[in-house]
Interface confidence: low
């Protein structure tokens, strides 16, 4: 029949709820074309009568609702003035009771049903609802482990669930629910989403940035105690070491015997895209030999130093 065959990925769908698939293939459907849907190589097109449970709505095939027996290969034929393409879509329908079993056991789920949140960041989940204009969708409700999600950290925004300050406990099975209205009838749409947590950040800069010190001198009296912080920003997934050195030697090693100058315990705070690390150096008692010597903070390939200097004499 001269039509070129294009095979799309399998779609795995839930029974007893609406489903729609749009026959779009941008290189083809951008011009003047006609679209016709068929099931299982049938010569008879899918009905265009809107009262039919399965019908074609413009370029869409719409199931109101989908039933277990609807599994199969559907074809949409796109005919242009000088071309013909047949797109094959394999639909697999399963009985799904969201609160009984985990969606994780299902094969080849699309990315719409597997989403990732980034630890320590503000992030979001998306409820994918693809339906023709004839379908009106009501407000979306979100559930985790079958309980409606409430709380300050969660905000529903159109088709998304915003999650602030993502924690490890946010992984698990989610579902988004909406009421779809079509030709005066209402149907429930319930999409399950398996959510995993990752620590990887999206920040582009891989070189750590030393915020402080900035290669400068510090005036300090002889014999006093001094603590200086080294503040470093770096990507969340970095493997850089941060430390203080003097004469190219770790301060803890250089002053191993006297322990007069020591490196502190590193702490960090998580920001939206990166961590801020702080590691201090403590001078228990500043001695003459410390003046003029660069004490270096190292963070990966980045370095910055402080130099201790005696305060200028006060002649007042």
């Amino acid at each position: 029949d001269g039509c070129k065959d294009i095979f799309m990925k399998n779609e795995i769908l839930s029974a007893s709820q609406p489903f729609a698939f749009n026959c779009t293939f941008p290189p083809i459907t951008s011009g003047e074309v006609s679209v016709t849907w068929y099931k299982n190589s049938s010569k008879i097109p899918v009905s265009k009568i809107i009262q039919s449970r399965i019908h074609q709505d413009e370029t869409w095939i719409l199931f109101l609702p989908m039933e277990w027996g609807d599994s199969g290969v559907y074809q949409c034929v796109i005919k242009g003035r000088d071309s013909c393409h047949r797109i094959h879509v394999n639909l697999t329908v399963f009985e799904k009771h969201w609160c009984d079993t985990s969606i994780g056991g299902l094969p080849n789920l699309s990315d719409e049903y597997k989403q990732i949140l980034h630890l320590g960041k503000d992030d979001s989940l998306t409820c994918h609802l693809h339906f023709p204009k004839s379908c009106v969708l009501g407000p979306i409700k979100w559930y985790k482990d079958c309980n409606e999600i409430k709380g300050e950290r969660f905000t529903v925004l159109e088709t998304r669930l915003l999650v602030s300050n993502v924690s490890a406990e946010d992984r698990g099975n989610y579902a988004c629910q909406a009421i779809l209205t079509h030709s005066g009838k209402q149907y429930e749409v319930l999409n399950g989403i398996t959510v995993s947590i990752t620590e990887r950040a999206g920040y582009g800069g891989s070189v750590p940035k030393i915020i402080y010190p900035k290669n400068h001198s510090i005036e300090v009296q002889l014999g006093t105690t001094l603590i200086v912080d080294c503040n470093v920003t770096d990507t969340k997934d970095n493997t850089n070491l941060r430390c203080w050195r003097v004469n190219n030697t770790l301060v803890d090693d250089y002053y191993d015997e006297s322990k007069r100058i020591r490196e502190g315990v590193e702490t960090h705070v998580s920001f939206r895209e990166h961590n801020l690390y702080t590691v201090n150096i403590t001078f228990l008692e500043v001695k003459m030999e410390d003046y003029g010597l660069p004490f270096m903070c190292h963070a990966g390939v980045s370095t910055a130093y402080i130099i201790l200097q005696l305060p200028a004499p006060d002649f007042r």
Epitope: Y203, K209, I211, T233, V269, R272, E273
Partner: antibody, heavy 120, light 106 residues
Framework: EVQLQQSGPSLVKPSQTLSLTCSVT??????GYWNWIRNFPGNKLEYM?????????YYNPSLKSRISITRDTSKNQYYLQLISVTTEDTATYYC??????????????WGQGTSVTVSS | EILLTQSPAIMSATLGEKVTMSCRAS?????MYWYQLKSGASPKLWIY???NLASGVPARFSGSGSGTSYSLTISSVEAEDAATYFC?????????FGGGTKLEIK
């Protein structure tokens, strides 16, 4: 040097939509966070929201039903839309961003500000 | 929502005087940010991460604090310091600003 250049109308009628553009040079909006802040008469600052490097948006809950922040990465611009404005939305609107030098939360680079009056 | 209360709302200082302005948070804040605003200009980042001076900020300025109590100090006020200073928190959304402290020079 990062520069933010704002454009948009200075007068908007009540119930209409306020639309502002922030054009960014010296940095890509596909890195970092791109914020909108406004300053009401009498110097009261309000943080409105941001669009992130990935396109994720955060909106101040007090504005959530009326605000939209979008972007066009090909133009390196981001946008503010505030629908159904009232005279209470009269303010100077600023776009602003941080920068890796200042941790992205610190609002280091600011646009020149757009003074918007809502009046019929 | 974290409420940031700045005091005093307006303060007057003579040249060379040491001044301190306060910012109190209704609940714990991880870091405080300070901005300087002068009439007809855009705000400028002044202090970030509680105590770090932004580029170009004179060394006479300092920031300190933790938990719910933060402050900005000028060791010796100069005429160019006349401005309104705002504190801001990014710890908890919605992100909020204080009401500002207006510093006037006598």
């Amino acid at each position: 040097e990062v520069q933010l250049q704002q454009s948009g109308p200075s007068l908007v009628k009540p119930s209409q939509t306020l639309s502002l553009t922030c054009s960014v040079t010296g940095a890509s909006i596909t890195s970092g966070y791109w914020n909108w802040i406004r300053n009401f008469p009498g110097n009261k600052l309000e943080y409105m929201g941001y669009i992130s490097y990935s396109g994720y948006t955060y909106y101040n809950p007090s504005l959530k039903s009326r605000i939209s922040i979008t972007r066009d990465t090909s133009k390196n611009q981001y946008y503010l839309q505030l629908i159904s404005v009232t005279t209470e939305d009269t303010a100077t609107y600023y776009c602003a961003t941080g920068g890796y030098d200042y941790v992205e939360d610190a609002l280091y680079y600011w646009g020149q500000g757009t003074s918007v009056t809502v009046s019929s | 929502e974290i409420l940031l209360t700045q005091s005093p709302a307006i303060m007057s200082a003579t040249l060379g005087e040491k001044v301190t302005m306060s910012c109190r948070a209704s609940s714990n804040v991880r870091y405080m940010y300070w901005y300087q605003l002068k009439s007809g200009a855009s705000p400028k980042l002044w202090i970030y991460l509680t105590s770090n001076l932004a580029s170009g900020v004179p060394a006479r300025f300092s920031g300190s604090g933790s938990g719910t109590s933060y402050s900005l100090t000028i060791s010796s006020v100069e005429a160019e310091d006349a401005a309104t200073y705002f504190c801001q928190q990014f710890t908890t959304s919605p992100y909020t600003f204080g009401g500002g402290t207006k510093l006037e020079i006598k």
